[in-house]
Interface confidence: medium
Amino acid sequence: PRSIDVKYIGVKSAYVSYDVQKRTIYLNITNTLNITNNNYYSVEVENITAQVQFAKTVIGKARLNNITHIGPLDMKQIDYTVPTVIAEEMSYMYDFCTLISIKVHNIVLMMQVTVTTTYFGHSEQISQERYQYVDCGRNTTYQLGQSEYLNVLQPQQ
């Protein structure tokens, strides 16, 4: 097993707001990661960079710096939030997300995350990609793993 394991657990919550005039959707998506240090020494989680894609278009980016340190044979669960905007050429989604006649307005988003860990100045980067369902029609809190979208495109663990 690699010395640092990063596991994308899933979407924890998605908070939605709209701009009616611009036909724009704002989604604040909080994700959960498990980072396991299989080494016999501590490592620093220097930064987490994340982006969210919808229909192959990047709709949001985030970066967290100087996050935490993880002791030997230890694991930390880290939440990070990516603010996303669905607008302009994707404003057609506004109608779907605000449609009252349907209860759940799930869209499929691709979550990409890169974790940079350091030890004595040496950096290691680990990336993950996951497809997730997110409801763009209401504020939602998910049980971990509940939002997972399984299809043939999804890279295996």
Partner: antibody, heavy 120, light 112 residues
Amino acid sequence: QVQLQQSGAELIRPGTSVKVSCKASGYAFTNYLIEWVKKRPGQGLEWIGVINPGSGITNYNEKFKGKATLTADKSSSTAYMQLSSLTSEDSAVYFCARSDFITTVVADYWGQGTTVTVSS
Amino acid sequence: DIVVTQTPLSLPVSFGDQVSISCRSSQSLTNYYGNTYLSWYLHKPGQSPQLLIYGISNRFSGVPDRFSGSGSGTDFTLKISTIKPEDLGMYYCLQGTHQPRTFGGGTKLEIK
């Protein structure tokens, strides 16, 4: 002062299992790793595996995967090693020891050892 | 797994002697970051092993200064400057750099 108190000697039938305990005192249990080591008569020390009691994450010597299972109970500051499907080859003295997170001093304090005898 | 070879297997001594025990690993014990986790232990019959030296050359608390460690990379040495009766027993080196940790086969320090 730092102490690791192990459970008493065990006489076990072949094919059964045994759980050896290692109770820590005199230090912060979750700030140190717990190592397990095997010593058979006439043979050298053999490293079995290590557990971080805070996270429960383990790392095993390949030879002992499936044989030894390491666990820890934070509330009682006790580490455990379960040995399964016992044979005469498992008759040995088993030691626990602690290792420092920060300085990576490996196995600085040891338990007194638990003798496991497998016999029908 | 890392193979750790200790020599000699047996070391007959007289009290007052100076002796050296060698420990050689199948690959470097210095990790990417320049740290080397090599320890020495003394194990006497009926007792628990006791840590003598860690990190190649650091004496553990309470260990007499007649014990010293040296080496780098793959070759390490434990020196005992003046053998005393309480020094008799089995000596082991342990590499803690790589997973899994591995002990050397041991060196028996016994009276001639």
